[in-house]
């Protein structure tokens, strides 16, 4: 991929674009401020979703981790004619149908929507739309809202998890690329690491989860360290201590040698889950090593 | 495991109204995400969606019988009601409850209502 | 809200493959599920979310979405797979319903 920062959290991404007649002549730069952020997510275990919204709302690519695909969606991405109305909601309902597929399946994977929008939504329509994005929330989503040139920021601030969560981008399409790290920084979240990554059997153990983006939750009260064990069993322990960068977590007291725990981060008190690559392992520890 | 069931069926005179419940259990409208639909299915014909109510309390109705219906949820009792005003003998259906948001997973076994003076 | 034109009647042998359409304008992107009702029953879900398959219901059945058709696909069909079939998508808060297909195992 290019080159600069990167995300390497494995969760469900949806990009939720407006194609309303406003945007007809900047359908360019919004579709390459998509490839550019869709491009720095690299987890294999991250997928993703294009979701285009005018007078309605249509998944132009669904929900997958298949990197071809991908590539294949983002060439229909270009392909969009702008054209109708912004009926935002349409959009938020698209994502919030997927999310809740995939919950059903019991996959219970963690949901990061970043909505675009120019324009300001009339009051039903933005009635809607706040609806809708507290119907992908109550799924466990965490959304966040890039507007740009007429915009209403106090809109998006209620559409989106919070100001914190809202982009504005007031210098007109073309600076949308100037924004591309921001969101990313924001957007992320990911697990890098665990110290120590080898833990003795049978033993009581406290483990630092490296990564990034640690405090985006809502509510930093609700964040989880998941255990995966072997598998099969999932062990949620509350964490010691929250900061960006890293948590602070009771380990799970794993009996046996060999035994493998996978990471994961759940945002919202277990409702889903941040999957990464990173395993603790336990080995046999002699006394006094 | 999850089960519902309508009220006994009816005989309605038209310009009456229709008051249906249904009764569920095996899982919890407290829980976000899912919600309870009403379906009605005349003699022979097609399946037509009524209603449905989200576990938030949101409501969406069926644009062509909006006016005539409205949903409600008592989720202590594990029931949701559905009344429908104004009954033509074109109502006349079976009407199922169903569990789900954007499907329907489980389903009541239905229940006969016929408008006839 | 979408339209969604399934044929009234499709037949096949049994140990054939049935293929059971469902058009609408770029249904491709948005969902679809199947049902299956027979005579005298609730309907019972046989596919979501375009492919998925509930447990429970055999393998026989799939689904696929694309362009302006859905397909819900019986191979091997059986004569208890005889019954009539309903497509259904979610569109702007609502749930819609096809028309049904009667399927025949000859």
């Known amino acids: 991929e290019d080159g600069g920062p990167a995300c390497y959290g494995g969760f469900d991404l949806y990009f939720i674009l407006d194609k309303s007649g406003s945007v007809l002549h900047h359908w360019n730069e919004i579709y390459y401020f998509v490839e550019q952020l869709a491009h720095k997510f690299i987890s294999p275990q991250l997928r993703m979703s294009f979701i285009v919204f005018s007078t309605r709302g249509t998944t132009l690519m669904k929900l997958t981790e298949d990197r071809e695909q991908i590539r294949q969606g983002l060439e229909e991405l270009q392909k969009v004619l702008p054209g109708g109305d912004t009926y935002m909601h349409e959009g938020f309902e698209r994502a919030s149908e997927q999310i809740y597929y995939e919950n059903r399946q019991g996959y219970r994977t963690a949901s990061v929507i970043i909505a675009l929008t120019d324009g300001e939504l009339h009051e039903d329509l933005f009635f809607y739309s706040e609806r809708e994005a507290n119907r992908s929330r109550d799924l466990g989503a965490i959304v966040y809202c890039v507007g740009v040139k007429d915009f209403n920021e106090t809109q998006l601030a209620r559409i989106a998890d919070s100001k914190d969560h809202v982009f504005p981008v007031n210098d007109g399409f073309q600076a949308l690329q100037g924004i591309i790290h921001s969101i990313l920084k924001k957007s992320c979240i990911e697990i890098l690491a665990a110290e120590p990554s080898t833990i003795c059997a049978g033993e009581s153990f406290q483990v630092v989860v490296r990564g990034n983006g640690f405090r985006h939750a809502r509510n930093v009260d609700r964040v989880l360290c998941s255990f995966k064990i072997n598998d099969s069993v999932t062990l949620n322990e509350k964490p010691f201590s929250v900061e960006d960068t890293y948590l602070l977590c009771p380990a799970p007291i794993l009996k046996e040698v060999g035994m493998k725990a996978a990471l994961q981060v759940s945002m919202n008190d277990g409702l889903s889950f941040i999957s990464s690559s990173v395993i603790i392992t336990t080995t046999h520890c002699s006394d006094g090593s | 495991q999850v089960q519902l069931k309508e009220s006994p069926g009816a005989l309605v005179k038209p310009t009456q109204t229709l008051t249906l419940t249904c009764t569920f259990s095996g899982f919890s409208l407290s829980t976000s995400g899912g919600g309870v639909s009403w379906i009605r299915q005349p003699p022979g014909k097609a399946l037509e969606w009524l209603a449905h109510i989200y576990s938030n309390d949101d409501k969406s109705y069926s644009t062509s019988l909006k006016t005539r219906l409205t949903i409600s949820k008592d989720t202590s009792k594990n029931q949701v009601v559905l009344t429908m005003t104004n009954m033509d003998p074109v109502d006349t259906a079976t009407y199922y409850c169903a569990r789900g948001g954007y499907f329907l997973d489980y389903w009541g076994q239905g229940t006969l209502v016929t408008v006839s003076s | 809200d979408i339209e969604l034109t399934q044929p009234p009647s499709v037949s096949v042998a049994p140990g054939q493959t049935a293929r059971i359409s469902c058009s609408g304008d770029n249904i491709g992107g948005i969902y679809v599920h199947w049902y299956q009702q027979k005579p005298g029953q609730a309907p019972v879900l046989v596919i979501y979310a375009d492919s998925k398959r509930p447990s429970g219901i055999p393998e026989r059945f799939s689904g696929s979405n694309s362009g302006n058709t859905a397909t819900l696909t019986i191979s091997g069909t059986q004569a208890e797979d005889e019954a009539d079939y309903y497509c259904?998508?979610?569109?702007?808060?609502?749930?819609?319903f096809g028309g049904g297909t009667k399927l025949t195992v000859l």
């Open positions: 259904q998508s979610y569109d702007i808060t609502s749930l819609v």
